[in-house]
Amino acid sequence: ACPLEKALDVMVSTFHKYSGKEGDKFKLNKSELKELLTRELPSFLGKRTDEAAFQKLMSNLDSNRDNEVDFQEYCVFLSCIAMMCNEFFEGFPDKQPRKK
Amino acid sequence: ACPLEKALDVMVSTFHKYSGKEGDKFKLNKSELKELLTRELPSFLGKRTDEAAFQKLMSNLDSNRDNEVDFQEYCVFLSCIAMMCNEFFEGFPDKQPRKK
């Protein structure tokens, strides 16, 4: 598979790796989200491991307010991180593809 | 880097690999989008290479109607593909993580 197709596959499989641990197997509860972030996105989390930060993040992702993060909410989250990465990328011309 | 962080990096770098070819270097025009889809997402495209299908897809992605696809619109598109993959994943219990 092409790298982008592999990337999409990783997004899906990573979600289910953690959503499958407790409760609704198609949703991430707070502890599952915490584990996913800690293990799979350590660069995003950094040192922010305090409870209030997790609660805020969970609340911001949980658009339907069911105390869980479903796959659509997770995709929105990953898109936000990708957009932050993209802003960083666009801010460093030497890291960018050739000028048009 | 962890697989999910690599996946996000691939999302960003793939966009710029094609957006950097002509016109606005931070947006995909129609020909750049066509090339990205053909080369990076062949499974998604399948046999749908006719012009009308591309025009329709371009129109659907271009939410701000500027005839180009910016990074945010591209993320929405990838999220939609990921959600389709996820529906397929959830539809096959033997492929799922262990039951809770």
Epitope: Q55, S59, S63 | -
Partner: antibody, heavy 120, light 107 residues
Framework: QVQLQESGPGLVKPSQTLSLTCTVS?????????WNWIRQHPGSKLEWIGH???????NYNPSLKNRLSMSRDTSKNQFSLKLSSVTAADTAVYYC?????????????WGQGTLVTVSS | DIQMTQSPSSLSASVGDRVTITCRAS??????LNWYQQKPGKALKLLLY???RLHSGVPSRFSGSGSGTDYTLTISSLQPEDFATYYC?????????FGGGTKVEIK
């Protein structure tokens, strides 16, 4: 200390639109919270109306959805409610509340409430 | 919608009494249960959230327990300022719903 203050007309004629505004002070009107409207009918029954929160995300009570509109003005630290085609059944004390980000999203701060009477 | 049923609807008690109020949900609400106090003519005040967690500034005589569909608010030793109406509310899913209230009166 967070304070919420409801404002708007206390009397609305049937079939008209009820409009209320809540002003938040003592706290920045941040994305970390959802801002709610709740009403208490004369018999003390409490009814959640809806809320607005992260990224402008809005959720309405399905029983009121077709008559409801909510918005916010972050520059003024305000959020507002519009309920159209009101009847006597909409007579209630209307509260604006802040929804915490903690488990179960409790309503941790409340306005003092404003009585809205629907009558001709 | 999830229905919340409180009992009793009212009770009479004396200062120093132990008071228990129950709340039943029409389906499992996974401990996402909050309790509020309201005095006449005033807004509600949050007491407990997520079944048993005390909101800041709330006296420790208030406690909560339960799981699944059945939950309890307990006041270990009733004080004069505790005479009020108490409401439960589920935070499990939308739309948010409240119990009908329990009025605690002086015996």
């Amino acid at each position: 200390q967070v304070q919420l203050q409801e404002s708007g007309p206390g009397l609305v004629k049937p079939s008209q639109t009820l409009s209320l505004t809540c002003t938040v002070s003592g706290d920045s009107f941040t994305n970390d919270y959802y801002w709610n409207w709740i009403r208490q009918h004369p018999g003390s029954k409490l009814e959640w109306i809806g809320h607005i929160g992260y990224g402008g995300n809005i959720n309405y009570n399905p029983s009121l959805k077709n008559r409801l509109s909510m918005s916010r003005d972050t520059s003024k630290n305000q959020f507002s409610l519009k309920l159209s085609s009101v009847t006597a059944a909409d007579t209630a004390v209307y509260y604006c509340t802040r929804e915490s980000f903690y488990d179960g999203y409790p309503f941790d701060y409340w306005g003092q409430g404003t009585l809205v009477t629907v009558s001709s | 919608d999830i229905q919340m049923t409180q009992s009793p609807s009212s009770l009479s008690a004396s200062v120093g009494d132990r008071v228990t109020i129950t709340c039943r949900a029409s389906q499992d609400i996974r401990n996402y249960l909050n309790w509020y106090q309201q005095k006449p003519g005033k807004a509600l005040k949050l007491l407990l959230y997520y079944t048993s967690r005390l909101h800041s500034g709330v006296p420790s005589r208030f406690s909560g327990s339960g799981s699944g569909t059945d939950y309890t608010l307990t006041i270990s030793s009733l004080q004069p300022e505790d005479f009020a109406t108490y409401y439960c509310q589920q935070g499990n899913s939308l739309p948010r719903t409240f119990g009908g209230g329990t009025k605690v009166e002086i015996k």
